[in-house]
């Protein structure tokens, strides 16, 4: 399906005129990642994908924006506030915290291009950094000193 029919410069527009601004301010995910305290979901499976076998298990939540490439990004959401016991796979160990691991991913936003005298000349791609949570990791709690 072609959703971006005029994505990129209009006919006759030099590609060097494309707007490729670099933004160093990461865009945050849609909502803060709060651990899910639903007891059934807070467990490490014996099989299945990495995110469900981890002792800091997580799920993925879709973040879709049709004016962005890639349009679909997935944010990890921790299922437990603490780490899960390796022995039982279900009991939480308060000595470890389950925390999100972030990555600043390069994305491109579609923006209207403006030619001379403010005329609309197709679409341009604007490069941005976008903060994505990749996974949850089991970490030792910070000691506030």
């Amino acid at each position: 399906y072609s959703h971006w029919p005029s994505c990129c410069p209009s006919k006759g527009q030099d590609t060097s005129e494309e707007l490729l601004r670099w933004s160093t301010v990461p865009v945050p995910p849609l909502e803060p990642a709060r651990p899910n305290r639903h007891p059934e979901s807070c467990r490490a499976s014996e099989d299945g994908p990495l995110n469900s076998r981890a002792i800091s298990p997580w799920r993925y939540e879709l973040d879709r924006d049709l004016n962005r490439l890639p349009q679909d990004l997935y944010h990890a959401r921790c299922l437990c506030p603490h780490c899960v016991s390796l022995q039982t796979g279900s009991h939480m160990d308060p000595r470890g915290n389950s925390e999100l691991l972030y990555h600043n991913q390069t994305v491109f936003y579609r923006r209207p291009c403006h030619g001379e005298k403010g005329t609309h000349k197709g679409y341009c791609l604007e490069r941005r950094l976008y903060r994505v949570s990749l996974a949850c990791v089991c970490v030792r709690p910070r000691v506030m000193g």
Partner: antibody, heavy 122, light 107 residues
Framework: EVQLQQSGPELVKPGASMKISCKAS????????MNWVKQSHGKNLEWIGL????????SYNQNFKGKATLTVDKSSSTAYMELLSLTSEDSAVYYC???????????????WGQGTSVTVSS | DIQMTQTTSSLSASLGDRVTISCSAS??????LNWYQQKADGTVELLIY???SLHSGVPSRFSGSGSGTDYSLTISNLEPEDIATYYC?????????FGGGTKLEIK
């Protein structure tokens, strides 16, 4: 030929939970997102949510958070929707629908299951 | 959430007629609009995606148009098998939302 075969009609008691299945065939299951849609009184269509079978990633309509849970079983190419704490308001026909795309530009439900009728009654 | 409105809930037409079904969005949806057909037995099929693109296998008598907030589906030469309910759906923003449906009947 793309086919989505849903489980049969269900009559369930208020307060109970139930799971509807949607078995996909005729395409690579993990390559396409699966949507779920509710139709009440044979009229209004309401989008419940979607799941990406590749990574289990989901997006829910806020109105169905806590009501519906979407999962997949990749080994059997089957998508599931569990409905929790059922009430008479949940009596409806539920559809699974594959989300078609061309590689990276998505978003039309191009194939639908036949629907599963759920009646909640004591 | 984006509200989708199909003001005509039912429509009567004769075979061979040209029929237009309209749909409006509560805000601009940049042509991110699909049309679906639901038959009396509950079967749902995609007709049109991205406002005007015909889904594979759909007869060419179906066409779609529109922009901004206003969209329409046109059946140029009504056939008996077109008797169904038609729904528009936006996918500009999650959650996806549908119009209330327009039921097409034969005069």
């Amino acid at each position: 030929e793309v086919q989505l075969q849903q489980s049969g009609p269900e009559l369930v008691k208020p307060g109970a939970s139930m799971k509807i299945s949607c078995k996909a065939s005729g395409y690579s299951f993990t390559d396409y997102t699966m949507n779920w849609v509710k139709q009440s009184h044979g009229k209004n269509l309401e989008w419940i949510g979607l799941i990406n079978p590749y990574n289990g990633g989901t997006s829910y309509n806020q109105n169905f958070k806590g009501k519906a849970t979407l999962t997949v079983d990749k080994s059997s190419s089957t998508a599931y929707m569990e409905l929790l704490s059922l009430t008479s308001e949940d009596s409806a026909v539920y559809y699974c629908a594959r989300e078609g795309y061309d590689g990276y530009l998505y978003f039309a439900m191009d194939y639908w299951g036949q629907g599963t009728s759920v009646t909640v009654s004591s | 959430d984006i509200q989708m409105t199909q003001t005509t809930s039912s429509l009567s037409a004769s075979l061979g007629d040209r029929v237009t079904i309209s749909c409006s969005a509560s805000q601009g949806i940049s042509n991110y609009l699909n049309w679906y057909q639901q038959k009396a037995d509950g079967t749902v099929e995609l007709l049109i995606y991205y406002t005007s693109s015909l889904h594979s296998g759909v007869p060419s008598r179906f066409s779609g148009s529109g922009s901004g907030t206003d969209y329409s589906l046109t059946i140029s030469n009504l056939e008996p098998e077109d008797i169904a309910t038609y729904y528009c759906q936006q996918y500009s923003k999650l959650p996806y939302t549908f119009g209330g449906g327009t039921k097409l009947e034969i005069k």
